[in-house]
Interface confidence: low
């Protein structure tokens, strides 16, 4: 659901990751988009406690930029998804081991909540930076 609005990021969980004056997409399918999206990051972050130092900053960037997507203002505000290549870099390079564990836990139903699934992008469904350089966000 891409109904929402653009707003300057005023949260806390992604403060260290997003640009200071970042314009982010807030999804109005949530009653309180700012808090709901912050909670999504928080829930996913609890699962990321034990990741490696190599994976951690990449995972932070991916999480925050996926849940608080860059927003293209206009008559219809539009979220700009992360470029597929950056998503794949996190999945296959920086966090390969952790990503496998996460997928295994998901398949085996070991997560207490399915909320984290909303926090993890499906890389294959994201636009490539080679299609249209302005259609996706670079981490």
């Amino acid at each position: 659901d891409n109904k929402g609005y653009c707003a300057q990021y005023r949260g806390e969980v992604c403060n260290a990751v997003l640009a200071k004056d970042a314009l982010v997409f807030l999804n109005t399918s949530y009653a309180d988009p700012e808090e709901a999206q912050e909670l999504l990051v928080h829930t996913a972050w609890n699962e990321l406690k034990v990741v490696s130092p190599v994976c951690r900053p990449a995972a932070e960037a991916l999480l925050c930029n996926h849940i608080f997507q860059e927003c293209s203002p206009g008559v219809v505000p539009t979220p700009i998804p992360i470029c597929r290549e950056y998503c794949l870099a996190v999945k296959e390079l920086f966090c390969a081991k952790e990503w496998l564990v996460m997928e295994e836990k998901t398949h085996r139903g070991l997560y207490r909540s399915e909320m984290h699934l909303l926090s993890v992008p499906e890389c294959s469904k994201l636009p490539s930076m080679h299609w249209d350089p302005t259609a996706c966000a670079r981490l």
Partner: antibody, heavy 120, light 108 residues
């Protein structure tokens, strides 16, 4: 840089309500989380609760029934109310930035603290 | 209720290494934070996210994590490091904050 300053009465009678205000200067309260922490004389630290600038609150379960934290973004202040106080609530009360249960959940900076004594 | 356990006191000679531990069942899942508090002063953050050091904190302060225990290490302890040290973390479900009971570091 951001500075915090607690204010309020230093003496409260048993069974009454303790009220403190924290004024934030050098930055806007309209981001981050804002917390209250207390320290009884000669003892350790105890987290009381926090408020997000939007008004969402989380409280320590052990104090939840007596605590109210509110925010006034127009004054760049947030406040603590603790009801039905007893001598056990005598402590130095600190306000601090942070404590949001997310990526950046440390307390920094802190106010200098204000001693509140509960006595008749 | 969830608890973090610290030794009440640790003593070291100047120049030696001080290690202060903090134990809690949720520490494998939740980050730990360390604060230094000198008499009559507010606490100061010295380590965040288990092992990160804020700017302005001397390099002799470091943090590590192993299972249910996190450790604050002060290498080459100086007289000015004498203080109380508190660890902070969340319960396993991440709903409230807990502080350890504090450790008094004495520099002999």
């Amino acid at each position: 840089q951001v500075q915090l300053q607690e204010s309020g009465p230093g003496l409260v009678k048993p069974s009454e309500t303790l009220s403190l205000t924290c004024t934030v200067s050098g930055g806007s309260i309209s981001s981050y989380y804002w917390s209250w922490i207390r320290q009884p004389p000669g003892k350790g630290l105890e987290w009381i609760g926090y408020i997000y600038f939007s008004g969402r609150t989380y409280y320590n379960p052990s104090l939840k029934s007596r605590v109210t934290i509110s925010v006034d973004t127009s004054k760049n202040q947030f406040s603590l109310k603790l009801s039905s106080v007893t001598a056990a609530d005598t402590a130095v009360y600190y306000c601090a930035r942070g404590g949001g249960l997310g990526i950046s959940n440390w307390f920094d900076p802190w106010g200098q603290g204000t001693l509140v004594t509960v006595s008749s | 209720s969830y608890e973090l356990t610290q030794p009440p006191s640790v003593s070291v000679s100047p120049g030696q290494t001080a290690r202060i531990t903090c134990s809690g069942d949720a520490l494998p899942k939740q980050y730990a934070y360390w604060y230094q508090q000198k008499p009559g002063q507010a606490p100061v953050l010295v380590i965040y996210k288990d092992s990160e050091r804020p700017s302005g904190i001397p390099e002799r302060f470091s943090g590590s994590s192993s299972g249910t225990t996190v450790t604050l290490t002060i290498s080459g302890v100086q007289a000015e490091d004498e203080a109380d040290y508190y660890c902070q973390s969340a319960d396993s479900s991440g709903t409230y904050w807990v502080f350890g009971g504090g450790t008094k570091l004495t520099v002999l």
